[in-house]
Amino acid sequence: SGVFQLQLQEFVNERGVLASGRPCEPGCRTFFRVCLKHFQAVVSPGPCTFGSVSTPVLGTNSFAVRDDSSGGGRNPLQLPFNFTWPGTFSLIIEAWHAPGDDLRPEALPPDALISKIAIQGSLAVGQNWLLDEQTSTLTRLRYSYRVICSDNYYGDNCSRLCKKRNDHFGHYVCQPDGNLSCLPGWTGEYCQQPICLSGCHEQNGYCSKPAECLCRPGWQGRLCNECIPHNGCRHGTCSTPWQCTCDEGWGGLFCDQDLNYCTHHSPCKNGATCSNSGQRSYTCTCRPGYTGVDCELELSECDSNPCRNGGSCKDQEDGYHCLCPPGYYGLHCEHSTLSCADSPCFNGGSCRERNQGASYACECPPNFTGSNCEKKVDRCTSNPCANGGQCLNRGPSRMCRCRPGFTGTYCERHVSDCARNPCAHGGTCHDLESGLMCTCPAGFSGRRCEVRTSIDACASSPCFNRATCYTDLSTDTFVCNCPYGFVGSRCEFPVGLPPS
């Protein structure tokens, strides 16, 4: 689609005569008829196949035609066409005399013709005007012409339609040849594809406008090159989306099991030493003068029963004081004024004279101690049971009752529920306070990974561009069924754009 433009510049008819030689009365009131048609080697009458146009009266006898795009007179004359410009044409320009105001062909006498010129040739589309001058014996016409494309049409023959746009359907202007020229930040055949932020990860990132980088599910960061850990993860990181790789000191499926309770919680009080002993488990070694699971209890000086021979202990600010029974003296009532004759040995202890009868010593039966065998042996005073075990006096010996998950004479060994490898099919075993837990490899499930399940290889949405994902049950892998226009194992490449 385009326009043939004809610019009339000057018409000379000095004698003011018609083609017949007869003069016009009072002068030749001149108007023009233009006929544009397909190329003919010899221009003949017939339909104006490319269009025709008439002018109003432009002057009398000889005159210059001024440029005018307003009013009745339009110069240059416009002959629009809505087909591909063929590059060749025939042009007929007739100058007529108008005796009256009616310029219709049927209203004019045949001899009102002043002159007629016909040209033919090649004409390329372009902005430049071709200047021509045609002379007959009595008249001369100077004019120029050109062919230009209509708005939104481009190319050598005005056949390429291109309308600039900046909307959802494209972001471009049109080049002179009709090709699209994308606006900055846009690419693709119709400039619909934004150019993402430089460095934006090709697979993990995308954009809906230029210089943007939006992440696909499971990825984060400026360039979408960092994964997001699993929703339930507490103290872990990832190397691929939805993983939960535990930070140091944490364990369990979601890294919520505290393996370093001592550091994270500092449970031991009063300067005690803390030792980790498994998940959420610890042992406090108390400083002298403190007791309790967390060494939170301050020992009374009298708690160690320092007074011997039945002496009673009284706490004092600066220590303690022993009140001795009759026959004993000393800081701890350790000295006796008694002899074996006073039967000082209790609980079946036997008395032995010393220092020629000035003192004595008691030999105690099992389970009793003290200068006078007055104290029952408590074999639990040294807190021998580790890991929260309970100490029990059993006659001449003691026994530790261990908490679940521990064993040994002193509960010093952690019982691993995982020792017997209970997880089938390569499952990973985790010791928990409540028992063991198996983390199963892909394709297995159940408390002990004993059930074979089909892997949903499509669970991670591996297919791009709205492809349909299928799980190949024989190989437990995914297969992407690409929509029209996309290829690749994940349908990630548009047809015609091979992987770079």
């Epitope: 809906s208 939006l214 992440c215 696909r216 599910p217 499971g218 990825w219 984060q220 960061g221 400026r222 960092e226 997001i228 850990p229 929703n231 339930g232 993860c233 507490r234 103290h235 872990g236 990181t237 930070d247 669970a459 949405s461 709205r466």
Partner: antibody, heavy 118, light 107 residues
Framework: EVQLVESGGGLVQPGGSLRLSCAAS????????MSWVRQAPGKGLEWVAS????????TIGDSVKGRFTISRDNAKNSLYLQMNSLRAEDTAVYYC???????????WGQGTLVTVSS | DIQMTQSPSSLSASVGDRVTITCRAS??????LAWYQQKPGKAPKLLIY???NLADGVPSRFSGSGSGTDFTLTISSLQPEDFATYYC?????????FGQGTKLEIK
């Protein structure tokens, strides 16, 4: 136990500013992306902004872009939302949440009410 | 932006009933859909993610299904504590968008 506690809400005049804070505990804060989600009185939920974990890359919703900024301080286990040029339509309960714009919002705070009114 | 449409907007049911809530996306979101439960004056709580995965500590009476554009939340046997408002949310396309909510009331 994961805990998110928002603070800083209150009554503010149109055109005013407010800064919301969120204190996180019970998880390694620096490992996870965080978001703000809001809920106008009697209405549904609307995502406001997200921030990535290590490079603190902020993504802001169109309705608040140019007015709100999201930031974090991993050393203080804290998330922030700076709200400027507040409008009546910003009136809502603002929730701090662990999650990103392309993931589920796994944990939520109790919310803090922001009222924009003259 | 992707529109998420929940139906019904509200429903009444009794303890022990089986209840189904649906959520429709205006375009394909694959399986990137979550469900939340919200009680009056409280924050939302994640129930289900990736269409059918139960979040930590959520009772097994809750289940999710669907793919593409149509999704369902099912409560197999309603308990008194399940009466609340439920929201679906897509996180496949930016920005993330929520459904308008479904209020589950006691009949």
């Amino acid at each position: 136990e994961v805990q998110l506690v928002e603070s800083g809400g209150g009554l503010v005049q149109p055109g005013g500013s407010l800064r919301l804070s969120c204190a996180a505990s019970g998880f390694t804060f620096g490992n996870f992306p965080m978001s703000w989600v809001r809920q106008a009185p009697g209405k549904g939920l609307e995502w406001v902004a997200s921030i990535s974990s290590s490079d603190s890359w902020a993504t802001i919703g169109d309705s608040v872009k140019g007015r709100f900024t999201i930031s974090r301080d991993n050393a203080k286990n804290s998330l922030y939302l700076q709200m400027n040029s507040l409008r009546a339509e910003d009136t809502a309960v603002y929730y701090c949440s662990r999650g990103y714009y392309n993931s589920p919002f796994a944990y939520w705070g109790q919310g803090t009410l922001v009222t924009v009114s003259s | 932006d992707i529109q998420m449409t929940q139906s019904p907007s509200s429903l009444s049911a009794s303890v022990g009933d089986r209840v189904t809530i649906t959520c429709r996306a205006s375009e394909d979101i694959y399986s990137n859909l979550a469900w939340y439960q919200q009680k009056p004056g409280k924050a939302p709580k994640l129930l289900i993610y990736d269409t059918n995965n139960l979040a930590d500590g959520v009772p097994s009476r809750f289940s999710g299904s669907g793919s593409g554009t149509d999704f369902t939340l099912t409560i197999s046997s309603l308990q008194p504590e399940d009466f609340a408002t439920y929201y679906c949310q897509q996180y496949n396309n930016y920005p993330p968008t929520f459904g308008q909510g479904t209020k589950l009331e006691i009949k």
